[in-house]
């Protein structure tokens, strides 16, 4: 039985040119968490794998860097990084879970987020 | 340099069984996944079966369950297919694969033939 | 399950033509695609992976595009050593499965 619930960031936003962190966590379950991958709709990002490491997808390496922790970092943001992102974590033995965040990358300075998600 | 080496295979009669072996080599076995893949004579690639980097999750196609085992060793870095009950369509090219993230087979074994013929 | 069907089944080319290859999922898989090039007598080799990622060691003329449902494979200039088997392969979900082949002949 999965008993595990995903907390993701949810709805953010963020400056264009500027830098966030997608971050979940994965809570109530004893699960063994075995692979993140960070998909954003329909293009892998990024895995993060518990024996492996990491692995940024090539067209992704120059703008995303691994972390912290599972999360992952979007680096040079621009209005075409606007979309859903998915933390899709991969547990042992529950199976998968998935999280969810909406990102919004604004033109102008009117971008606001929690402050422990933002890179200064 | 990574080497995958598949053992094991040859002529075996309807009902019989067959162990097939990989030897692995050139990286650290025991943190990859590991499929087995083959091909009939003339014929596409078919998934066999998986096995993931501790042995804790198994997965195998439809036409081999219950007749088929994976398993691994390891401290040996060796990957293991048990082949029981075989049939005529069980003759393939078996391959041997790792598995980087479960994803996709960045390296293949040379394979080995199975025939299962009487 | 999910079925791979790729299409054409073969095709005939000159050396510097630009070749596509299409595979088709029976449902969505994201971009959890793969692409394999086989030689007769030997073991295939991955070529693409994750719908549009190229492998280590391949050649640049290789290229991979699509996600969801519909994935293409390019090889923009082909080479005398590009005759070959193509396959793509889902790994979305087990059963893992493979498109039943392109074979790519000179013309």
């Known amino acids: 039985m999965m008993t595990g619930t995903i907390e993701t960031t949810g709805n953010i936003s963020a400056e264009k040119g500027g830098s966030i962190i997608l971050q979940c966590h994965l809570s109530s379950t004893t699960a063994q968490v075995t692979q993140v991958n960070w998909e954003q709709q329909d293009q892998l990002l990024a895995i993060c794998n518990a024996d492996l490491g990491w692995h940024i997808s090539p067209s992704f390496k120059d703008r995303v860097a691994p972390g912290p922790g599972l999360g992952l970092t979007l680096q040079s943001l621009t209005v075409n990084d606007t979309g859903e992102y998915f933390c899709i974590y991969h547990t042992y033995p529950d199976g998968t879970y998935t999280g969810r965040i909406f990102l919004e990358v604004l033109e102008s300075s009117v971008a606001e987020h929690g402050a422990r998600f933002q890179i200064p | 340099e990574v080497q995958l080496l598949e053992s094991g295979g040859g002529l075996v009669q309807p009902g019989g069984s067959l162990r097939l072996s990989c030897a692995a080599s050139g990286f650290t076995f025991s943190s990859y996944s590991m499929h087995w893949v083959r091909q009939a004579p003339g014929k596409g690639l078919e998934w066999v079966s998986s096995i993931n980097s501790n042995a804790g999750t198994i997965s195998y196609a439809d036409s081999v369950k219950g007749r088929f085992t994976i398993s691994r060793d390891n401290s040996k870095n060796t990957l293991y297919l048990q082949m029981n009950s075989l049939r005529a369509e069980d003759t393939a090219v078996y391959y041997c694969?790792?598995?980087?993230?479960?994803?996709?087979?960045?390296?293949w074994g040379q394979g080995t033939l199975v025939t299962v013929s009487s | 399950d999910i079925q791979m069907t790729q299409s054409p089944s073969s095709l005939s080319a000159s050396v510097g033509d630009r070749v596509t290859i299409t595979c088709r999922a029976s449902?969505?898989?994201?971009?959890?695609l793969n692409w394999y090039q086989q030689k007769p007598g030997k073991a295939p080799k991955l070529l693409i992976y994750?719908?549009?990622s190229l492998q280590s060691g391949v050649p640049s003329r290789f290229s991979g595009s699509g996600s969801g449902t519909d994935f293409t494979l390019t090889i923009s200039s082909l080479q005398p050593e590009d005759f070959a088997t193509y396959y793509c392969q889902q790994s979305y979900s087990t059963p893992l499965t493979f498109g039943g082949g392109t074979k790519v002949e000179i013309k």
């Open positions: 694969a790792r598995v980087p993230y479960d994803y996709w087979i960045d390296y």
């Open positions: 449902q969505s898989i994201s971009s959890y």
């Open positions: 994750a719908a549009s």
